[in-house]
Interface confidence: medium
Amino acid sequence: EVEKTACPSGKKAREIDESLIFYKKWELEACVDAALLATQMDRVNAIPFTYEQLDVLKHKLDELYPQGYPESVIQHLGYLFLKMSPEDIRKWNVTSLETLKALLEVNKGHEMSPQVATLIDRFVKGRGQLDKDTLDTLTAFYPGYLCSLSPEELSSVPPSSIWAVRPQDLDTCDPRQLDVLYPKARLAFQNMNGSEYFVKIQSFLGGAPTEDLKALSQQNVSMDLATFMKLRTDAVLPLTVAEVQKLLGPHVEGLKAEERHRPVRDWILRQRQDDLDTLGLGLQGGIPNGYLVLDLSMQEALS
């Protein structure tokens, strides 16, 4: 708490200007009217206040707005935002995308702080869903943002927002998250033609089921090995050698280098060695000729 002291004669601030950088803490507290500060917040950023002085300015705003700052003040916080705690931010009602952008700009280049995470949470909850413009903004500042959300949170993303997602935004997503995002992407891109569709859906395929992979194999998509290696193992296992060959096209030769890694390893173990030999890649570990293959999953389903 800053001690309450009378403002020295002639030092009462009539506007927020650079002379204030020479005011001591107690002078700022005594001589700057909180309402004046609130209406001229946009000037604070241009003045080289010390962090100590910013503490005083924040304290003044807190006293003026104990229930939380209005958006007109929040939008102009600038680097004073870095002094806010998540508790402060939880009191805010941020509805403007411009306000969100202004505050994210302050934190640009840094990892997502608890303050920023709280701000985004408040903003998204206020909007009710993660719309395209918001997602565009958030992924521009934090490419990993989408993958930081839980599958439950991702379920509120409308398919129309998927258009804002770039491949790098999905780099750190796990299979559970892709399981939620893939059907949305499939819906979002459903009206595109084959090759364009594949370019867009490719990043989401870690959530694709077997039947969709089978369908893609009929479309000459030439999936690269990096994408194939990110597919769900359970979705790859039922694919036939012919289907995988069609799916990968010229990239099929890359299977050899990945034969010890999932999902290729597990897929090889499910194929007849005869069928694998047709690829001419020297893949080993398939089911020897003459062995009977029991589909235990089908047996369990029937029993």
Partner: antibody, heavy 118, light 107 residues
Framework: QVQLQQSGAELVRPGTSVKVSCKAS????????IEWVKQRPGQGLEWIGV????????KYNEKFKGKATLTADKSSSTAYMQLSSLTSEDSAVYFC???????????WGQGTLVTVSA | DIVMTQSHKFMSTSVGDRVSITCKAS??????VAWYQRKPGQSPKLLIY???TRHTGVPDRFTGSGSGTDYTLTISYMQAEDLALYYC?????????FGGGTKLEIK
């Protein structure tokens, strides 16, 4: 990338003045503060003052008021520090540093050696 | 003025060691503490600010901690390139002040 290029070493007479420059590149010069720091041989680091290149606003260490004057030229993205009435006590390496992205003293210039000698 | 004291001028260490450099402020600086690394012939480099926030590009073996008046820079796994002089600094109020520095040397 952010770079601060300082002017070369200076050998000056006692009682005269010297102006050290610090040219910033790789970022929006007017957006972030420029700090100035002094280091005498075998001594620690001393903060001289800070300037906001966008507004020209400054703040000085009381110890350097009247000794150092900080200015900035937006058009050339260059900050300056003028040292006046030089004595042997002013012989030191002077650094500029940028509070880039609101990080304190995030990037430093290579330093300028000022030697005051008759 | 706030005085920043680094009690150890020198510290002996070996590659692979966990090293902790301490710094004490003469008053509460509310976690507004930065750490800098300086190698011979080079300018200081910012490692940590706000006591624990790692600056862009700084390896994660460097961590900062502390509050109130006591702060620590820890190198979890000392590497040869970490041999340098380390300064703490308070960026809470002007005049910003630096510690006297701690030089890491090989045992």
């Amino acid at each position: 990338q952010v770079q601060l290029q300082q002017s070369g070493a200076e050998l000056v007479r006692p009682g005269t003045s010297v102006k050290v420059s610090c040219k910033a590149s790789g970022y929006a010069f007017t957006n972030y503060l420029i700090e100035w720091v002094k280091q005498r041989p075998g001594q620690g680091l001393e903060w001289i003052g800070v300037i906001n290149p966008g507004s020209g606003g400054t703040k000085y260490n009381e110890k350097f008021k009247g000794k150092a004057t900080l200015t900035a030229d937006k058009s050339s993205s260059t900050a300056y520090m003028q040292l006046s009435s030089l004595t042997s006590e002013d012989s030191a390496v002077y650094f500029c540093a940028s509070d880039y992205d609101y990080d304190p003293f995030a990037y430093w210039g290579q330093g300028t050696l000022v030697t005051v000698s008759a | 003025d706030i005085v920043m004291t680094q009690s150890h001028k020198f510290m002996s260490t070996s590659v692979g060691d966990r090293v902790s450099i301490t710094c004490k402020a003469s008053q509460d600086v509310s976690t507004a503490v930065a750490w800098y690394q300086r190698k011979p012939g080079q300018s200081p480099k910012l490692l940590i600010y706000w006591a624990s926030t790692r600056h862009t590009g700084v390896p994660d073996r460097f961590t900062g901690s502390g509050s109130g008046t006591d702060y620590t820079l820890t190198i979890s796994y000392m590497q040869a390139e970490d041999l340098a002089l380390y300064y703490c600094q308070q960026h809470y109020s002007t005049p910003y002040t630096f510690g006297g520095g701690t030089k890491l040397e090989i045992k």
